[in-house]
Structure formats: structure tokens, C-alpha cells
């Protein structure tokens, strides 16, 4: 048993059918030696009496809000919370798995620069009873500041049957400098409480592997002189990292008809600019991508031909 | 006719070439070492310059001394003035810095040499490092350093296990990857000034 | 007294459908997640299928995937497995278990998938 | 196929020691704890071990189980007539758990 805040502690325990569970001393904080009892959530049943209280925990219905009392007066409360290893793994109920970039991916981290500045996001299909906790920092053994806001849920979706639930956190690392050189990851540890089950989620990572920049902006079409070309140009996003010839983009331009069946013409180039041919009713999209680390593609940024 | 490219432009399309090398070789480490670990998530950082050169330093960006985050690093430094800076280029920061980045790749070298040499020593080939890269590393050297003299440094004795010799070659490899990136953004920014 | 009693095999042609039933008992049969596993005869364990307890995800190998859909009744403290497009490979004993450090299997139902 | 790899079989008199090894990789036994069955012919697996070393009340001290890195090992120390069965390692992959993963089993001869 551990203390996750003040009067609200995890009771870790092996989930099998018939497990034995943990036997728990509950202590009220009183100076009272007397005339106390016990009751659990809105019960009034009285559980024990005495300045502790043993139980031994091994299901849902053991957890809750334990509460001594003296003469009808309330002296103190222990909230208890279940944190179930299931065949040695800690349960993974509350979250979604993304399954992108790969399994078991239930936090997911962006980055539109090198700023130390990162998002991450996660989903679940609970709407109620649900808290979040965010920590971060860089490396562990020997952990640099990250600062991390509040979770707040960011967007809902239907999905078949279900809704779904994604919440996000804005994280920033206390002196970062944009030139480093990343050796120890950025650690992100979520704790989530839904009733009565807590559990936790980690994410490692260094901020240059999940750079997405922002699409690219002012996309703008120049055609040319008796020519079907045009001169497609852009600039580097607001949000990238400057200066930009030390923190260069790459581009990748693509020219897509009306029908996705179409085949897609694609150039890719360090400039910002280039001349393609702009079919009738075809659109021209850029995108943008870190000029020397292989991290994730930009959203397109998008114009039509006509 | 030939086009003649100039020192800075040509350093450029030589660290980009470098990149591409250093790219290639990660890629085969992590596929054929597998076994061992060799993934970035997985190995110890550990960067073999440190202390020794004082690349991130002196290759700052101007508009980056501000932040006082990116000046917390060390001293050292080393000059040699390669045909990677134009002549009317030739301040004190930008000799530094190329300098320093000659002392990185020397390092890097050396130490390949010497994990080739242990590799080629095992009798199971499961890995050598590619010629490219070390031909590419080879290059901006020279580039950096052309009119000083080649230093080829005898690479220390090679380690006879060859589990540990994998292990070095997948944490340096990574390292130096990363170091890459860092000299590539340098050129491109030196090559912009 | 924990107990699990799997139901439902027999013979069956190929093609054809088969819906086996696992009947637990002794315990809090919603709070866990259970697993199919079979065994061909004469060959090892072979994990199939396994569904969360409040039956929110299920998650099968390559082998039975869009085949074999497994669920649950807590109600009725029932696990299931529909097993449909029957193949002669599918032709094992199979096995309910509780998912947990300390599991309990049933005794399993022969499943014979023959012409 | 199963990608945890066991001995196909290992033999021994009574009395003897046998050790049944489980080898598998990083994503499986290195990063999930390991569980051992024993089957004897016509009935349900039973575990032995569980957590890699830990074994249910009411099996005998007798069976004995470890893990160093990537492989697990089962040993039957005072080898009995009954032990003779066939036996399987189970872990998980840290991509597809929960998914079990078994070993392809081995089959224990009590000789003479």
C-alpha cells in the first residue's frame, strides 16, 4: 500500500480468482484514543472499532472511503483505491490502446519544434468518474524539470457504438535549449483514477522523435507563361524552430486529381518552392518534414489548381 | 565543362552524403543486431566527445545565444580551417566550430576503425560497418582540414568479446547519428550566412 | 470453489459452425478476464482467444482471427467461443482459463472437425 | 509456430535432477515474468510456477523455476515416477499480451 495524496492510498493487489488479497492497517489521525468506529462510503454500518482498523482487501467492494467517527462527529478519512496486476502486468482498463506506432501505445506525444514544448493525448470510452495526474521529466535516475498542465478532455468522437474520449496535456521542459543534443528521454507518467481503480501509464521518448512541424503556410500558385506549370511557394510555419537554415524543413509537394484512384505526382525538394503541372480539377498539397531526421510528415497544406 | 563547387557548398553535399551513410549503417545495426538491443530506446546514450570537443557550443547559432539554456555546456577547442568556410568567412566562432567537428569525426573514426577491426577479427560476419560511411566521414574530414596534415590515429587494440563489441558499435552508431544531424544543421547554417 | 466447465464441442464438417460454452463457478466470474486455449491432439498449447472482464476488448491469434469471435454473459457467468468456417485444423480439445497469476482451466470439450 | 523454443524431450531415473529449459527474446520472457504446466496425458495443464520462481501451495518443493534474461528454466530435483508428463513454459509478448505465449512443451521420461 502506498500513498498516492493525502488520505487517498493504491492497494496493490495479484487480481486472480480466490487470491487471499492484502490485509490493511487503517490508522485514524486523531489524538483520540477511544469511543471510535468505522464505516465504509455512505454505510453506516459500523466496520470496527478502535484507533485502527485491519481489513483485509481483495475486491472493489472492499475499497472506498474509510471513515472514523467519534460521537458523530467525523475525525478522519482513508480513501482506498485497487491497482490490479494481472499474471504479473499492471491493468491497462482505463486507456485505449492507439496501436500506433505500435501496440501497447496508450500515451501519444507531439512536438511542433524543438522548443522542449510537447502535447500528449489518450483516449478511453469513460465519460464519468475519471481523473488524471500528469508528471514529466527528463531522464530518470537523475530527473531534469518538465512542467506539465492540467489533462482536459480535447475531443469526443462516436465510434460504432461507443464514444470515445480523448484527453490532452501540454507539457514544456524548464531549460530547454533547441540545439541540444537529446542522450536522456522525456518521461511521462499519467496516473488515472476511474471510481475506485488506479492505474498508471508511461511514455518515453526523446522530443526529436516526435517532431510533427505544422503544415507549411501561405501556400500561394504562380502560373507561368504559356506553360501548364505553375509556380507552387510556400513558407516555413510560424510555430517551427528558428533559425530556420540551422533547423531546415524538406518538402514533399503532390499534385492529386479530383478521384483519390488518380495517380499521385509527388516532387520533393529543400527549396520553397517549385513548378509542377496543375491539372484541371486536381489540387496541390505540401508538406513539411525535419531536412535531417527521419520524424513524422506534416499535415498537407492545400490549394487548388484552378 | 565542370562546375567548380565552392568549400562551404561542398562541405554541405559531403555531411548531407554523410547523413545518408550514417543513416544506412543504424538501419542494418538495429535489423542485424537485434539480439543486442540495438534500438535508441533500448541503449545507453553515451556520447564520446564529451569533455573533448565543444561542438554544440561553438556551433550555436548566433540567434540561439540568448537562450541562456544552450550556453550551459563545456570548454574546449580546436582549430583548423578547411576549405569549408569561404575566406572572407574566417571569424573566430565559425574556425571553432569546424574545428571542433574535425576533432568529433577524428574521434568517431578511430574508434570504427577499431570496432572494424574487431569485428573482422570474429569469425561470424554478422556485421561490418559499411565503407560508405567511413569513406563519407573520410571526405569532410579532409574537407575540414585540407590544408593540414591527415592525421590517421592507430586504432586502440580491439575488444575480444564479441557480444561487447556489438554493444560499443550499437551505442556509438547512435551517437554519432545524432552528432550528424548536429553537423548537418552547422553546414547548412554556416553555408546560409 | 473455483470451477470452470467448458460445454458444446463434437463433431462437425468443415465450413460449419460450432458455439462452445464455459460455465464458471466460485468466484466473481465479472471481475476477470478469460482465455480460450486448445490443443491439437498430440501437439502443444495453443492460445485462441481472450476477452476483458467487462468484455470491453477481445483480442484473438492470427490463426482464428475473423473465424472465432469469444464473449461473455456475466449474468449468466458464461464465457463463449462461436466458432465459425470450421477448418480440420481447428481440431483440438479446448480449454476455458481464468486470466491471473494463479489460473484455473476447465477440464475441455473435443472439438473434431471431419467429413 | 510458437516462438518460446523448449527441448522436445529430456529424460532421467528416478531420483535424478532434469532441468527444462524456455528460451524466447527481449519483447517476451525478458520483459514478462514466466509460468510453468505440467500435463499428464488426458488432462488440463496445472501450474507449477508462476512469476518465474514461485510455486502454488501444494506443489512440491521438488520443482524449482528461475529466469536470467531472455530464458526461463524448470528443474525437478528427486525425479518421481509421477513426474513423468509433458511440460510447457507460457510468458507474454509486451506488444501482443495478452495474448499467452506457450513453449512447444517437453516431454519428461522417467527411465527404468
Known amino acids: 500500500i502506498w500513498e498516492l495524496k493525502k488520505d487517498v492510498y493504491v492497494v496493490e493487489l495479484d487480481w486472480y480468482p480466490d487470491a487471499p488479497g492484502e490485509m490493511v492497517v487503517l490508522t485514524c489521525d486523531t489524538p483520540e484514543e477511544d469511543g471510535i468506529t468505522w464505516t465504509l462510503d455512505q454505510s453506516s454500518e459500523v466496520l470496527g472499532s478502535g484507533k485502527t482498523l485491519t481489513i483485509q482487501v481483495k475486491e472493489f467492494g472492499d475499497a472506498g472511503q474509510y471513515t472514523c467517527h467519534k460521537g458523530g462527529e467525523v475525525l478522519s478519512h482513508s480513501l482506498l483505491l485497487l491497482h490490479k496486476k494481472e499474471d504479473g502486468i499492471w491493468s491497462t482498463d482505463i486507456l485505449k490502446d492507439q496501436k500506433e506506432p505500435k501496440n501497447k501505445t496508450f500515451l501519444r506525444c507531439e512536438a511542433k519544434n524543438y522548443s522542449g514544448r510537447f502535447t500528449c493525448w489518450w483516449l478511453t470510452t469513460i465519460s464519468t468518474d475519471l481523473t488524471f495526474s500528469v508528471k514529466s521529466s527528463r531522464g530518470s535516475s537523475d530527473p531534469q524539470g518538465v512542467t506539465c498542465g492540467a489533462a482536459t478532455l480535447s475531443a469526443e468522437r462516436v465510434r460504432g457504438d461507443n464514444k470515445e474520449y480523448e484527453y490532452s496535456v501540454e507539457c514544456q521542459e524548464d531549460s530547454a535549449c533547441p540545439a541540444a543534443e537529446e542522450s536522456l528521454p522525456i518521461e511521462v507518467m499519467v496516473d488515472a483514477v476511474h471510481k475506485l481503480k488506479y492505474e498508471n501509464y508511461t511514455s518515453s521518448f526523446f522530443i526529436r522523435d516526435i517532431i510533427k512541424p505544422d503544415p507549411p503556410k501561405n501556400l500561394q500558385l504562380k502560373p507561368l507563361k504559356n506553360s501548364r506549370q505553375v509556380e507552387v511557394s510556400w513558407e516555413y510555419p510560424d510555430t517551427w524552430s528558428t533559425p530556420h537554415s540551422y533547423f531546415s524543413l524538406t518538402f514533399c509537394v503532390q499534385v492529386q486529381g479530383k478521384s483519390k484512384r488518380e495517380k499521385k505526382d509527388r516532387v520533393f525538394t529543400d527549396k520553397t518552392s517549385a513548378t509542377v503541372i496543375c491539372r484541371k480539377n486536381a489540387s496541390i498539397s505540401v508538406r513539411a518534414q525535419d531536412r535531417y531526421y527521419s520524424s513524422s510528415w506534416s499535415e498537407w497544406a492545400s490549394v487548388p489548381c484552378s | 565543362r565542370v562546375i567548380p563547387v565552392s568549400g562551404p557548398a561542398r562541405c554541405l553535399s559531403q555531411s548531407r552524403n554523410l547523413l545518408k551513410t550514417t543513416d544506412d549503417m543504424v538501419k542494418t545495426a538495429r535489423e542485424k543486431l537485434k539480439h543486442y538491443s540495438c534500438t535508441a530506446e533500448d541503449i545507453d546514450h553515451e556520447d564520446i566527445t564529451r569533455d573533448q570537443t565543444s561542438t554544440l557550443k561553438t556551433c550555436l547559432p548566433l540567434e540561439l545565444h540568448k537562450n541562456e539554456s544552450c550556453l550551459a555546456t563545456r570548454e574546449t577547442s580546436s582549430t583548423t580551417r578547411g576549405s569549408c568556410l569561404p575566406p572572407q568567412k574566417t571569424s573566430l566562432m565559425m574556425t571553432l566550430c569546424l574545428g571542433s567537428i574535425y576533432e568529433d569525426l577524428k574521434m568517431y573514426q578511430t574508434e570504427f576503425q577499431a570496432i572494424n577491426a574487431a569485428l573482422q577479427n570474429h569469425n561470424h560476419q554478422q556485421i561490418i560497418l559499411d565503407k560508405g560511411m567511413l569513406v563519407a566521414i573520410d571526405e569532410l574530414m579532409q574537407s575540414l582540414n585540407h590544408n593540414g596534415e591527415t592525421l590517421r590515429q592507430k586504432p586502440p587494440v580491439g575488444e575480444a568479446d564479441p557480444y561487447r563489441v556489438k554493444m560499443k558499435l550499437c551505442i556509438l552508431l547512435h551517437a554519432f547519428s545524432t552528432r550528424v544531424v548536429t553537423i548537418n544543421r552547422v553546414m547548412g547554417y554556416l553555408s546560409s550566412a | 470453489q473455483v470451477q470452470l466447465v467448458e460445454s458444446g464441442g463434437g463433431v462437425v464438417q468443415p465450413g460449419r459452425s460450432l458455439r462452445l460454452s464455459c460455465a464458471a463457478s466460485?468466484?466473481?466470474?465479472?471481475?476477470?478476464?478469460m482465455h480460450w486455449v486448445r490443443q491439437a491432439p498430440g501437439k502443444g498449447l495453443e492460445w485462441v482467444a481472450f476477452i476483458r472482464y467487462d468484455g470491453s476488448n477481445k483480442y484473438y491469434a492470427d490463426s482464428v482471427k475473423g473465424r472465432f469471435t469469444i464473449s461473455r454473459d456475466n449474468s449468466k457467468n458464461t464465457l463463449y467461443l462461436q466458432m465459425n468456417s470450421l477448418r480440420a485444423e481447428d481440431t483440438a480439445v479446448y480449454y476455458c482459463?481464468?486470466?491471473?497469476?494463479?489460473?484455473?482451466w476447465g477440464q475441455g470439450t473435443m472439438v473434431t472437425v471431419s467429413s | 509456430q510458437s516462438v518460446l523454443t523448449q527441448p522436445p524431450s529430456v529424460s532421467g531415473a528416478p531420483g535424478q535432477r532434469v532441468t527444462i529449459s524456455c528460451s524466447g527474446s527481449?519483447?517476451?520472457?525478458?520483459?514478462?515474468?514466466v509460468k510453468w504446466y505440467q500435463q499428464l496425458p488426458g488432462t488440463a495443464p496445472k501450474l507449477l510456477i508462476y512469476y518465474n520462481d514461485q510455486r502454488p501451495s501444494g506443489v512440491p518443493d521438488r520443482f524449482s523455476g528461475s529466469k536470467s534474461g531472455t530464458s526461463a528454466s524448470l528443474a525437478i530435483t528427486g525425479l518421481q515416477a509421477e513426474d513423468e508428463a509433458d511440460y510447457y513454459c507460457q510468458s507474454y509478448d509486451r506488444y501482443t499480451h495478452p495474448a499467452l505465449l506457450f513453449g512447444t512443451g517437453t516431454k519428461v521420461t522417467v527411465l527404468g
Open positions: 466460485g468466484f466473481t466470474f465479472s471481475s476477470y478476464g
Open positions: 527481449r519483447s517476451n520472457i525478458g520483459s514478462n515474468t
Open positions: 482459463k481464468t486470466h491471473g497469476s494463479h489460473d484455473n
